[in-house]
C-alpha cells in the first residue's frame, strides 16, 4: 500500500497527463488544457479568477521556455509555488502546527 | 470535498511539518528528520539506499542554501525532482498514457 506522500506524487503526475492528453502535444498543457486543469482540480486556488487576462498572465508566468505551453517541469514549479503558499498559511497558525520543538 | 490534487498538495505540506517539527528549527528538516521522512514516507524512492554516505550526498544536494537543513522550498524542489522521474517513467509507457491526440 503506497504511503500518502507517494500517492500525492502519483496524483501530481496522473493529473497532468489527464489534461495534457487532450489536444496537441500530449506531454504539454496548452492554455485550454491548463484552464480546465485549474478549474476542475484546483478550484480553491483559482477562486473567482476566471477572466481571460488572468489565465493569460498565469500561463505566461509558468511558461519559462516561452513555447505557449506548460511542460511537466513548469507544472511542478507551479505546484511547488502553490504548496509554498499553503505552507506560509500553515506556518502562520502555530496552533495548527505539529508540536513545538 | 477537496479534489485529489488539492489533497496531494496538503499532504506535501503536512508531511513536511510532521517531521520538521521534531527537533531544532520547526520549519526545517535536519538530517535525521529528513532520513526519517524518506524512510517512512518515500520507501519506494529510497529502496535499499540506507547507507550514511547516500543520505549525506542527498542532504547536500537538497540543501541549496548550505545551512545543513532542508527548508520547505528545498523540499519542494526535491519532490518535484521525484515527480519528474515518475513522469519520465510514465511517458516511457505509452499504453499507460491517456488517449492519444
Amino acid at each position: 500500500m503506497a504511503c500518502p506522500l507517494e500517492k500525492a506524487l502519483d496524483v501530481m503526475v496522473s493529473t497532468f497527463h489527464k489534461y495534457s492528453g487532450k489536444e496537441g502535444d500530449k506531454f504539454k498543457l496548452n492554455k485550454s488544457e491548463l484552464k480546465e486543469l485549474l478549474t476542475r482540480e484546483l478550484p480553491s486556488f483559482l477562486g473567482k479568477r476566471t477572466d481571460e487576462a488572468a489565465f493569460q498572465k498565469l500561463m505566461s508566468n509558468l511558461d519559462s521556455n516561452r513555447d505557449n505551453e506548460v511542460d511537466f517541469q513548469e507544472y511542478c514549479v507551479f505546484l511547488s509555488c502553490i504548496a509554498m503558499m499553503c505552507n506560509e498559511f500553515f506556518e502562520g497558525f502555530p496552533d495548527k502546527q505539529p508540536r513545538k520543538k | 470535498m477537496a479534489c485529489p490534487l488539492e489533497k496531494a498538495l496538503d499532504v506535501m505540506v503536512s508531511t513536511f511539518h510532521k517531521y520538521s517539527g521534531k527537533e531544532g528549527d520547526k520549519f526545517k528538516l535536519n538530517k535525521s528528520e529528513l532520513k526519517e521522512l524518506l524512510t517512512r514516507e518515500l520507501p519506494s524512492f529510497l529502496g535499499k539506499r540506507t547507507d550514511e554516505a547516500a543520505f549525506q550526498k542527498l542532504m547536500s544536494n537538497l540543501d541549496s542554501n548550505r545551512d545543513n537543513e532542508v527548508d520547505f522550498q528545498e523540499y519542494c524542489v526535491f519532490l518535484s525532482c521525484i515527480a519528474m522521474m515518475c513522469n519520465e517513467f510514465f511517458e516511457g509507457f505509452p499504453d499507460k498514457q491517456p488517449r492519444k491526440k
Partner: antibody, heavy 120, light 107 residues
C-alpha cells in the same frame, strides 16, 4: 501609456563590450511581462537577442548566447544588455521591447531604438 | 530556428487598394504569428497577434488569417499612412524570428 527608452554609447570599438540600458516608464516593471532586446542591422532584418522575465528567467538567442549577459533592476524600472567581443557585424539599431502575455507573446511596446556603431 | 519568409519583398499600390502580404514559416507555428508595421526611422508597431487578433488602437482595415505554416496580412483599403514596411514574427518557440519585411510603396 508604456514608454521604453534605450541609452548607451553610440560608438563601440571592436573587441570591446557593448552596454545598453532600457528604462521603462508608465508601467510597473511587473512579472507579467518579459523585457526584450531586438536589433535591426542597417537595411537588413530584425534579430531577437534575448529577454528577461518572470522570476528573473532569462532566455538568449543561441547565436549570441556566449557573448550575452542580461540583467534587470526592478527598483529603477530598468533592464540591461551587455554584448562582449563586438565586431562590425554587431553594428545595428538596438531596440528594447515589452513582450505581452497574450497568445504568441507579441512585442506590444517598443523603444525608439539606439544606433550602435562598432568601429575603431 | 524557425525561418520566416515574407513575400513580396516590396510592392507598389495606390490609396484604396486591397493589399495582401504573405508569410511562410519553415514549420508549423500553430497560429503564433504576429505582424508589425515600421515607418522610416521609427520603431515597430504591433498590428496583429495570434494570426488575427487586432492590437488595441489598430484600424479594422488590417486583418490576418492563416494556419500551419502559411499566413496572410490584408489591408482592405490602403490609406496614405499605411505606406510602410511590414514584418511578420513567429511567437511559437525560441529564438523568436522575423520575416525579411515587405515594403509597401506608393504607385
Amino acid at each position: 501609456q508604456v514608454q521604453l527608452q534605450e541609452s548607451g554609447p553610440g560608438l563601440v570599438k571592436p573587441s570591446q563590450t557593448l552596454s545598453l540600458t532600457c528604462t521603462v516608464s508608465g508601467d510597473s516593471f511587473t512579472n507579467d511581462y518579459y523585457w526584450n532586446w531586438i536589433r535591426q542591422h542597417p537595411g537588413s532584418g530584425l534579430e531577437w537577442i534575448g529577454h528577461i522575465g518572470y522570476g528573473g528567467n532569462i532566455n538568449y538567442n543561441p547565436s549570441l548566447k556566449n557573448r550575452l549577459s542580461m540583467s534587470r533592476d526592478t527598483s529603477k524600472n530598468q533592464f540591461s544588455l551587455k554584448l562582449s567581443s563586438v565586431t562590425a557585424a554587431d553594428t545595428a539599431v538596438y531596440y528594447c521591447t515589452r513582450e505581452s502575455f497574450y497568445d504568441g507573446y507579441p512585442f506590444d511596446y517598443w523603444g525608439q531604438g539606439t544606433l550602435v556603431t562598432v568601429s575603431s | 530556428d524557425i525561418q520566416m519568409t515574407q513575400s513580396p519583398s516590396s510592392l507598389s499600390a495606390s490609396v484604396g487598394d486591397r493589399v495582401t502580404i504573405t508569410c511562410r514559416a519553415s514549420q508549423d507555428i500553430r497560429n503564433y504569428l504576429n505582424w508589425y508595421q515600421q515607418k522610416p526611422g521609427k520603431a515597430l508597431k504591433l498590428l496583429l497577434y495570434y494570426t488575427s487578433r487586432l492590437h488595441s488602437g489598430v484600424p479594422s482595415r488590417f486583418s490576418g488569417s492563416g494556419s500551419g505554416t502559411d499566413y496572410t496580412l490584408t489591408i482592405s483599403s490602403l490609406q496614405p499612412e499605411d505606406f510602410a514596411t511590414y514584418y511578420c514574427q513567429q511567437g511559437n518557440s525560441l529564438p523568436r524570428t522575423f520575416g525579411g519585411g515587405t515594403k509597401v510603396e506608393i504607385k
